[in-house]
């Protein structure tokens, strides 16, 4: 059962796992949610009746029954983790805490103009978990405007104390706001020989990398595969760090793999969701329950539905035994990972999918695409929407992309002459325009947010957000696309598609079925040569075949240029402008979305 409200002046008795310090009860709830075992918590607020050394303590708790006895206590605030909830969860915390000193290991001290600058510095520093900034009113003259970057083993403060005229806050890496590079490569036959901060068992290097990503101190990792010569180290995932933030030594070793934390690109890559099955593999751990199940998929469902289950091993039924049902062993451990991994015993193992909601919905795998042809099939581009105007008569106006449950990203030039959002309708999950009838459900538009530097498509800033009146319930046919990661600026996308209901040639009409075309990206230098009369800026991205023939056209505007990278689709461009359609040596020009990620997040995450 999902309980989101906080219980004031209430303390949960017993069940303590560990105590951390958090600046608020709200953040204590987030910490509890991300902790592998925490189901409930008690936070102590500052209060004259409470010992100051207990202020800001967040006691993480567990219970077999999923609840604990309640006791009345002034200044105590208790609640439940969001593990029990189905809604999307985020660790992003933009709050600034006034007059609080969040203590940790200060490793960088420098002058900053503002708390915002200090927070940005923290967000763009690989080691930083949180910061404290002494404001202009701080009593000690020499310490005014000092920005202290801090880290701890847990990512949370080691203590929090009241201190006038300072502010504290957290790194915004988990809000997708970091400019740090995102290195997704996994290096085979490589060992990073730096200090280990922790070690866990993992079935493969991908899971090891994901564990590293959500471990607060891990910057890179080394994984020893099941073929590693030293038996005691097989399936061992070593979580590592270094002062420079990069591995100091790389050693060539067969059967080992190494890689980096994906912290700065975690909003566009699954980090918590380990969805694969591992055949002929047994996960050992504390046994929670043993239940009969028809298949390993059914066993995974049982694990996902049991809030305390972290991973499972399924033993298929022996022929004609137990109505063909196998045994499903639901398991847990102190850190969420198996305590040991064994091979060759016939089990099929995997992890709970309960944590998938901690990942961005946009990272969910969608159905395989149809190769060849130009017409799309249902569910192939579930982020694509058709934006209609109802004035003077209803018609398709532009394309757009779902980027959040209340947000559509499109082009600014679509709204030339649009006086009010009231005349707009957004249809999602549509394949054919002919499906749209009088009674077809749509999303009304609450607000049109056009980039304030937009003048005309050709001069850039051709980007707009639509805030919907109601939220989109994600399904297979309507779900978001990931924004590109700022750390992915140097990625070369090779699998890019433009989609829309636009014209197929310059003088044509809106198409009934959603069209798709695979189009290669063109460098900005090359693009500039093709458009000598225009300035192709770094905020634009171009795509097209030299010989022409495939391109976006009238009516595709605002729609996505979608590129697949590491199995995840990213919204790389917004269809903006071009000379004619599909002309030779005239590539299409798109808004370069990565350059607007800050703008998008600022507008969509505004309180």
């Amino acid at each position: 059962e999902c309980v989101t409200q906080l219980l004031k002046d209430t303390c949960f008795e017993g069940g303590d796992i560990t105590t951390v310090f958090t600046p608020s009860a709200k953040y204590c709830q987030v910490v509890c949610t991300y902790h592998p075992r925490c189901l409930l918590f008690t936070f102590t607020a500052e209060s004259p009746s409470e010992d100051p050394t207990r202020w800001f303590t967040c006691v993480l708790k567990d219970s077999v029954t999923e609840t604990l006895p309640r006791v009345n206590r002034t200044a105590a605030i208790s609640g439940y983790s969001f593990k029990q909830c189905s809604h999307q969860i985020s660790a992003c915390n933009k709050d600034i805490y006034v007059d609080l000193d969040m203590k940790g290991i200060n490793y960088n001290s420098s002058v900053a103009k503002s708390a915002q600058e200090c927070q940005e510095r923290c967000t763009d520093d690989v080691h930083c978990h949180f910061f404290t900034y002494a404001t202009r009113q701080f009593p000690s003259l020499e310490h005014r405007n000092i920005c202290l970057l801090k880290h701890t083993q847990t990512g949370t403060p080691t203590r929090i104390t009241k201190l006038d005229k300072v502010v504290s806050g957290f790194s915004l890496k988990s809000c997708a706001l970091s400019n740090l590079a995102c290195i997704r490569d996994i290096f085979p036959n490589t060992v990073f020989a730096d200090s280990n901060i922790d070690s866990v068992m993992a079935p493969d290097a991908f899971v090891c990398g994901r564990i590293c990503t959500h471990h607060p101190g891990c910057l890179f990792f080394t994984f020893f595969s099941q073929e590693w010569p030293k038996e005691s180290q097989r399936n061992l995932c070593l979580l590592k760090t270094s002062e420079s933030g990069l591995p100091s030594t790389r050693i060539k070793k067969s059967k080992a793999l190494s890689g980096f934390s994906l912290q700065s690109c975690r909003h566009s890559i699954p980090v918590f969701c380990h969805s694969s099955f591992y055949h002929d593999t047994d996960f050992l751990g504390e046994e929670l329950d043993i239940v009969a199940a028809k298949s390993h998929e059914a066993c995974q469902k049982l694990c996902t539905n049991a809030v305390r289950c972290q991973f499972f091993t399924y033993t298929p039924a022996q022929a004609s035994c137990n109505e063909g049902k196998g045994k499903c062993y639901l398991k847990l451990s102190s850190n969420g990972s198996p305590t040991k991994i064994l091979h060759g015993r016939g089990g099929i193992s995997g992890y709970t999918l309960r944590l998938c909601k901690m990942d961005n919905e946009c990272t969910t795998k969608i159905k395989p695409r149809i190769v060849g042809g130009t017409a799309s099939v249902r569910g192939e581009w579930p982020w694509q929407v058709t934006l209609h105007t109802t004035s003077p008569t209803q018609r398709h106006l532009c394309g757009g992309s779902i980027i959040g449950n209340q947000w559509i990203l499109t082009a600014a030039h679509c709204f030339y002459g649009v006086e009010s959002p009231k005349i707009l309708r957004v249809y999602s999950g549509i394949l054919n325009q002919s499906e749209i009838k009088e009674d077809t459900s749509f999303f009304g538009v609450q607000e049109i947010i056009i980039h304030d530097q937009y003048k005309m498509a050709e001069s850039g800033y051709d980007i707009a957000l639509l805030k919907l009146e109601t939220t989109v319930n994600y399904t297979d046919s309507q779900r978001p696309i990931c924004l590109p990661s700022k750390g992915d600026r140097n990625v070369i996308y090779t699998d890019c598609w433009v989609t829309g209901w636009g014209y197929r040639k310059l003088r044509d009409k809106i198409q009934n079925t959603l069209q798709k075309a695979k189009i290669p990206l063109v460098t900005n230098e090359e693009c500039q040569k093709r458009y000598r009369g225009h300035k192709i800026t770094h905020k634009m991205i171009c795509a097209g075949y030299r010989e022409g023939g495939k391109d976006a056209c009238k009516g595709d505007s605002g729609g996505p240029l979608s590129c697949k990278h590491n199995e995840v689709w990213h919204l790389v461009g917004i269809t903006s402008w071009g000379e004619g359609c599909a002309q030779r040596e005239r590539p299409g020009v798109y808004t370069n979305v990565v350059e607007y990620v800050d703008w998008i997040l600022e507008k969509t995450q505004a309180v």
């Epitope: 001290s109 000690s140 020499e142």
Partner: antibody, heavy 115, light 107 residues
Framework: QVQLEESGPGLVAPSQSLSITCTVS????????IYWVRQPPGKGLEWLGM???????DYNSALKSRLSISKDNSKSQVFLKMNSLQTDDTARYYC??????????WGQGTTLTVS | DIVMTQSHKFMSTSVGDRVSITCKAS??????VAWYQQKPGQSPKLLIY???YRNTGVPDRFTGSGSGTDFTFTISSVQAEDLAVYYC?????????FGGGTKLERL
């Protein structure tokens, strides 16, 4: 845990120079300022100077011309150099860690005799 | 430079007494004053910073108050282990400076 340890020559002849090292552990010098304070026998505390996390320095006005503070972040060491020593520089020399201008951790001190 | 003056070099007290030590700054130092305790043969120990904030682990019988130029350090109920020298220090502006110290001794 946080520790600071001073090491010095113990005895120095008048007009000679002094070099004291403060070696720290449990924290990083890039994130904290370090102070030097001295205490002549039977007397009070005298603030000598400091080096900030970012390397800036501040000195006691009366001693500025004779003092120099530097550090090596990678070795976690802070250095106090003082020249033209006189007998009234005889004191116990302490290094201490900065917490918003106050000194939250102190070393045990090293005794210097100028004679 | 800012001069800190502790008017009493010595103060006599008994266990259980309330005692207050004063410190005066030669110019306004806002609330940037710290208090230290030093016992014979030991390094000074930070008790109070920014006038009234107690350092970690410091008993609540130690308090500080004041602002501008006049500051007071109070022990609400003196314990035998509190007999020591107490120094004030301004940390408003470098060069930072200490008061001359007040020795708290048994009556």
């Amino acid at each position: 845990q946080v520790q600071l340890e001073e090491s010095g020559p113990g005895l120095v002849a008048p007009s000679q120079s002094l070099s004291i090292t403060c070696t720290v552990s449990g924290f990083s010098l890039t994130g904290y300022g370090i102070y030097w304070v001295r205490q002549p026998p039977g007397k009070g505390l005298e603030w000598l100077g400091m080096i900030w996390g970012d390397g800036r320095t501040d000195y006691n006005s009366a001693l500025k011309s004779r003092l120099s503070i530097s550090k090596d972040n990678s070795k976690s060491q802070v250095f106090l150099k003082m020249n033209s020593l006189q007998t009234d520089d005889t004191a116990r020399y302490y290094c201490a860690r900065d917490y918003y201008g106050s000194k939250d951790y102190w070393g045990q001190g090293t005794t210097l005799t100028v004679s | 430079d800012i001069v800190m003056t502790q008017s009493h070099k010595f103060m006599s007290t008994s266990v259980g007494d309330r005692v207050s030590i004063t410190c005066k700054a030669s110019q306004d130092v806002s609330t940037a004053v710290a208090w230290y305790q030093q016992k014979p043969g030991q390094s000074p120990k930070l008790l109070i910073y920014l006038t009234s904030y107690r350092n970690t682990g410091v008993p609540d019988r130690f308090t500080g108050s004041g602002s501008g130029t006049d500051f007071t350090f109070t022990i609400s109920s003196v314990q035998a282990e509190d007999l020591a020298v107490y120094y004030c220090q301004q940390h408003y502006k470098t060069p930072y400076s200490f008061g001359g110290g007040t020795k708290l001794e048994r009556l």
